[in-house]
């Protein structure tokens, strides 16, 4: 089943997809499409890379990572509810039926309006059930979804997970392999978003 990612209306959505080039500079063509991965190619292509660069994209879709190192994670700018749905990341490895294909489900939620607290009574008043991570790009703050009441230790653990999981992924894999899909599975309480 698809791995689920969440973002709020008006924010940037981030859909992770990685592979390890066989050698530096040996890039593999990649396509991103709206809709589940078909047998070949991508349906409704929104972005495409080749062995050299990003050679096709549509408005609001771009790669904010180092695609020359195999980080082909998709950023969707300023999302609306209409951006919800399945996205396909396809690593087009040369050879017959060698492609790696991954379906990622994007769930867009209405923007949260969090009233500013009048005074900091306790931790949950100051940080009401929301944790964000910030990327370099404009408006690239995304929520981790609704959390139960949690303490500082748990927040720290979540923040460390966010920071460390990308590094762990980078160290774990080798060869022309995709990573990110099963590694970023959500549970009921946590929605992992990874940023630069």
């Amino acid at each position: 089943s698809e791995v689920e990612y969440r973002a709020e209306v008006g924010q940037n959505a981030y859909l992770p997809c990685f592979y390890t080039p066989a050698a530096p500079g040996n890039l593999v063509p990649v396509c991103w499409g709206k809709g589940a991965c078909p047998v070949f190619e991508c349906g409704n292509v929104v972005l495409r890379t080749d062995e050299r660069d990003v050679n096709y994209w549509t408005s609001r879709y771009w790669l904010n990572g180092d695609f020359r190192k195999g980080d082909v994670s998709l950023t969707i700018e300023n999302v609306t509810l209409a951006d919800s749905g399945i996205y396909c990341c396809r690593i087009q490895i040369p050879g017959i039926m060698n492609d790696e294909k991954f379906n990622l489900k994007l769930v867009i939620k209405p923007a949260k309006v969090t009233p500013a607290p009048t005074r900091q009574r306790d931790f949950t008043a100051a940080f009401p059930r929301m944790l964000t991570t910030r990327g370099h790009g404009p408006a690239e703050t995304q929520t981790l979804g609704s959390l139960p009441d949690i303490n500082l230790t748990q927040i720290s653990t979540l923040a460390n997970e966010l920071r460390d999981s990308r590094l762990a992924n980078d160290l774990r894999d080798s060869g022309a392999t995709i990573r990110g899909s099963s590694d970023y599975k959500d549970d009921d309480d946590k929605h992992h978003h990874h940023h630069h």
Partner: antibody, heavy 121, light 107 residues
Framework: QVQLVQSGAEVKKPGASVKVSCKAS????????MNWVRQAPGQGLEWIAD????????KYNQKFKDRATLTTDTSTSTAYMELRSLRSDDTAVYYC??????????????WGQGTLVTVSS | DIQMTQSPSSLSASVGDRVTITCLAS??????LAWYQQKPGKSPKLLIY???SLADGVPSRFSGSGSGTDFTFTISSLQPEDIATYYC?????????FGGGTKVEIK
């Protein structure tokens, strides 16, 4: 050490062609794209095209697609850029340059010394 | 093609000053921006690649920041040998395009 050594200055008449060479040494020639960039007198930098010597695959700036041809000779580690139907506004310094990730993902970026091409009647 | 708008086109600063140059891409280019230094009669020299990474042998007073469409190049303490023209270049999608350049002079 890495070196890109270009051919000498050229003076051409309008409508003629010029072929500039760039001899590479100090690295594996076939592993990196060779780019060609030009700079008109007192102006900025303009990318013309690139080529990957291992298979001859190239990409061109649309502006130059009909007039420029890139080739390589892997036996001598030399890249060539030919520009046809020269006009006076083609007067510029032409650079070869190679860049990309090398071993251990260290970025690799080297430029030739430049070749002045003057187009004048 | 992706247009790169660099500003200012020229600036004059004193030795030791902090100098900042900006580069704006017409479309998002992720991290794929490079900064070059060019002295008169010389080939361009790479200073920064992938927006923030310092090229080998480049002094640490040079730095870069940004991603997406907005990028900044900084010389933390201007030195006499930094007199040159500086160019940004996007390496996200070909044709690779350059900014118009910023000429840096000493007051």
């Amino acid at each position: 050490q890495v070196q890109l050594v270009q051919s000498g200055a050229e003076v051409k008449k309008p409508g003629a062609s010029v072929k500039v060479s760039c001899k590479a040494s100090g690295y594996t020639f076939t592993d990196y794209y060779m780019n060609w960039v030009r700079q008109a007198p007192g102006q900025g930098l303009e990318w013309i095209a690139d080529i990957i010597p291992n298979n001859g695959g190239s990409k061109y700036n649309q502006k130059f697609k009909d007039r420029a041809t890139l080739t390589t000779d892997t036996s001598t580690s030399t890249a060539y850029m030919e520009l046809r139907s020269l006009r006076s506004d083609d007067t510029a310094v032409y650079y070869c340059a190679t860049w990309g990730y090398g071993s251990s993902y260290r970025w690799f970026d080297y430029w030739g010394q430049g070749t002045l091409v003057t187009v004048s009647s | 093609d992706i247009q790169m708008t660099q500003s200012p086109s020229s600036l004059s600063a004193s030795v030791g000053d902090r100098v900042t140059i900006t580069c704006l891409a017409s479309q998002p280019i992720g991290i794929w921006l490079a900064w070059y230094q060019q002295k008169p009669g010389k080939s361009p020299k790479l200073l920064i690649y992938a927006a923030t990474s310092l090229a080998d042998g480049v002094p640490s007073r040079f730095s870069g920041s940004g991603s997406g469409t907005d990028f900044t190049f900084t010389i933390s303490s201007l030195q006499p040998e930094d007199i040159a023209t500086y160019y940004c270049q996007q390496l996200y999608s070909s044709p690779w395009t350059f900014g118009g350049g910023t000429k840096v002079e000493i007051k």
